[in-house]
C-alpha cells in the first residue's frame, strides 16, 4: 500500500463524507444537457459554452488555474457551490481524485450511452481548472476500473 493511503485515508474519508458533491453533479449534468440541446444532441460537437476552457494546448495544465466563470444563470449557482466544496480538497490531490471519482460513479447510471459518459467525463476533467484549482495527477475516472490494487 502507498504511504499516502496509510497517512491520509481516514482524513480523506471524513472529508468526502462531509462534502456535498451534489452541486457538482447537477452543474455537470445541466452542462452536458445544454450542450446536447445546442448541438443537436451531438456531445462531440465543439463546445461554445461559457464554462468551456480555451483550446490552448496547455489548457489542462493544472498549475495555471483560471478562476471559475460565474456566467450562465441555472448552472452558475451549482458551479459556485461545487467549487466551494472542491476547494476543501485543494491541498490533498489524492482526495481530490477520489471526490471526482465519486462524482463520476454517482452519475454513471444516469448517463445514457457511451457518448454521454465520455462528455460527462470530459467536463469533469475540466472542473478543477474551472474552479481555479489544480487538477490531480494519476487519477483514473473510468468507472469500470474497479479501484486500485495498491502495492
Amino acid at each position: 500500500r502507498q504511504q499516502w493511503e496509510l497517512q491520509g485515508d481516514r482524513r480523506c474519508q471524513s472529508q468526502l463524507e462531509r462534502a456535498n458533491l451534489r452541486p457538482c453533479e447537477q452543474h455537470l449534468m445541466q452542462k452536458i444537457q445544454r450542450d446536447e440541446d445546442s448541438y443537436g444532441r451531438d456531445p462531440y460537437s465543439p463546445s461554445q459554452d461559457p464554462y468551456s476552457p480555451s483550446q490552448d494546448p496547455d489548457r489542462r495544465d493544472p498549475y495555471s488555474p483560471s478562476p471559475y466563470d460565474r456566467r450562465g444563470a441555472g448552472s452558475s449557482q451549482h458551479q459556485e457551490r461545487c467549487c466551494n466544496e472542491l476547494n476543501e480538497f485543494e491541498n490533498n490531490q489524492r482526495c481530490m481524485c477520489e471526490a471526482l471519482q465519486q462524482i463520476m460513479e454517482n452519475q454513471s447510471d444516469r448517463l445514457q450511452g457511451r457518448q454521454q459518459e465520455q462528455q460527462f467525463k470530459r467536463e469533469l476533467r475540466n472542473l478543477p481548472q474551472q474552479c481555479g484549482l489544480r487538477a490531480p495527477q494519476r487519477c483514473d475516472l473510468e468507472v469500470e476500473s474497479g479501484g486500485r490494487d495498491r502495492y
Epitope: N91, Q137, Y151
Partner: antibody, heavy 121, light 108 residues
C-alpha cells in the same frame, strides 16, 4: 527553461547506501511530482517510484519497497533518492524525471542527466 | 503487475517506415507514451498520448493503439533515428509507472 541537475558518480561497496540528489530550476518545485528511473548497463528503463514535493507523499515500486527512500527539500528545490543494501545488481544510471499531465495522462518531458552508481567490492 | 512487451530490435532501410510495437493486456484503453534514447543520453519523449499537448517531435513520428497493441511508426527513416525506443504507461490499478523493455532501431 526546466532544468534537472543531478549529483555526480558514486562508487559504493556491497551492503552500503547511496544518496543521489536532483536539483531543479525553471518551474515551481512543489507543482509537479518527481520520479526516479534507473537503467542498468545495457538494460532498459526501470521505474523506482515518485515523490510529491508539495505533500511529501511517496509511492515506491514493489521491487524497491523497504530499500528506497525518496525525500525533498523545498528550500533547495531538490529531491533525493536513497537506496540501501546495495548489491552489484544496483549498478546503474539513476535518473530523476519530472511528471507531466493530469488525470490518467502521466509521462516525463524533463529528465536529469543521470547519476552513475557503481557497486563493487 | 502490468507488463509491456516490445521486440528487442527492428532494422529498417533509410527512407522506409519502421514500426515498433508495445503489447499488453488492454493497452488500447491506456495512455501510451513513447521515448527515444541515444547511447549515453537521457531519454526524450517522442510522442505523448496527451490531448492537450501537441507532440514535441516531427510529423514523421506517430503513435496508434488498439486492443492489446500500441505502436510507434517512424516514416522516412533517417540515420539520426537510430536509438532505443521505449513505450510507457501509468497503470491505474497498481498506481505504477511501467516501461516496455525497449526496442533498438537500427538504420541499415
Amino acid at each position: 527553461q526546466v532544468q534537472l541537475v543531478q549529483s555526480g558518480p558514486e562508487v559504493k561497496k556491497p551492503g552500503a547506501s547511496v544518496k543521489v540528489s536532483c536539483q531543479t530550476s525553471g518551474y515551481t518545485f512543489t507543482d509537479y511530482e518527481m520520479n526516479w528511473v534507473r537503467q542498468a548497463p545495457g538494460q532498459g528503463l526501470e521505474w523506482m517510484g515518485l515523490i510529491n514535493p508539495h505533500s511529501g507523499d511517496t509511492g515506491y515500486a514493489l521491487k524497491f519497497q523497504g530499500r528506497v527512500t525518496m525525500t525533498s527539500d523545498t528550500s533547495k528545490s531538490t529531491v533525493y533518492l536513497e537506496l540501501s543494501g546495495l548489491t552489484s545488481e544496483d549498478t546503474a544510471v539513476y535518473y530523476c524525471a519530472r511528471s507531466q499531465g493530469t488525470f490518467e495522462v502521466y509521462y516525463f518531458v524533463s529528465w536529469g542527466q543521470g547519476s552513475l552508481v557503481t557497486v563493487s567490492s | 503487475s502490468y507488463v509491456l512487451t516490445q521486440p528487442p530490435s527492428v532494422s529498417v532501410a533509410p527512407g522506409k517506415t519502421a514500426t515498433i510495437t508495445c503489447g499488453a493486456n488492454g493497452i488500447g484503453r491506456k495512455r501510451v507514451h513513447w521515448y527515444s534514447q541515444r547511447p549515453g543520453q537521457a531519454p526524450v519523449v517522442v510522442v505523448s498520448d496527451d490531448d492537450d499537448r501537441s507532440s514535441v517531435n516531427p510529423e514523421r513520428f506517430s503513435a496508434s493503439k488498439s486492443g492489446d497493441t500500441a505502436a510507434l511508426t517512424i516514416t522516412r527513416v533517417e540515420a539520426g533515428d537510430e536509438a532505443d525506443y521505449y513505450c510507457q504507461v501509468w497503470d491505474s490499478r497498481t498506481d505504477q509507472v511501467v516501461f516496455g523493455g525497449g526496442t533498438k532501431v537500427t538504420v541499415l
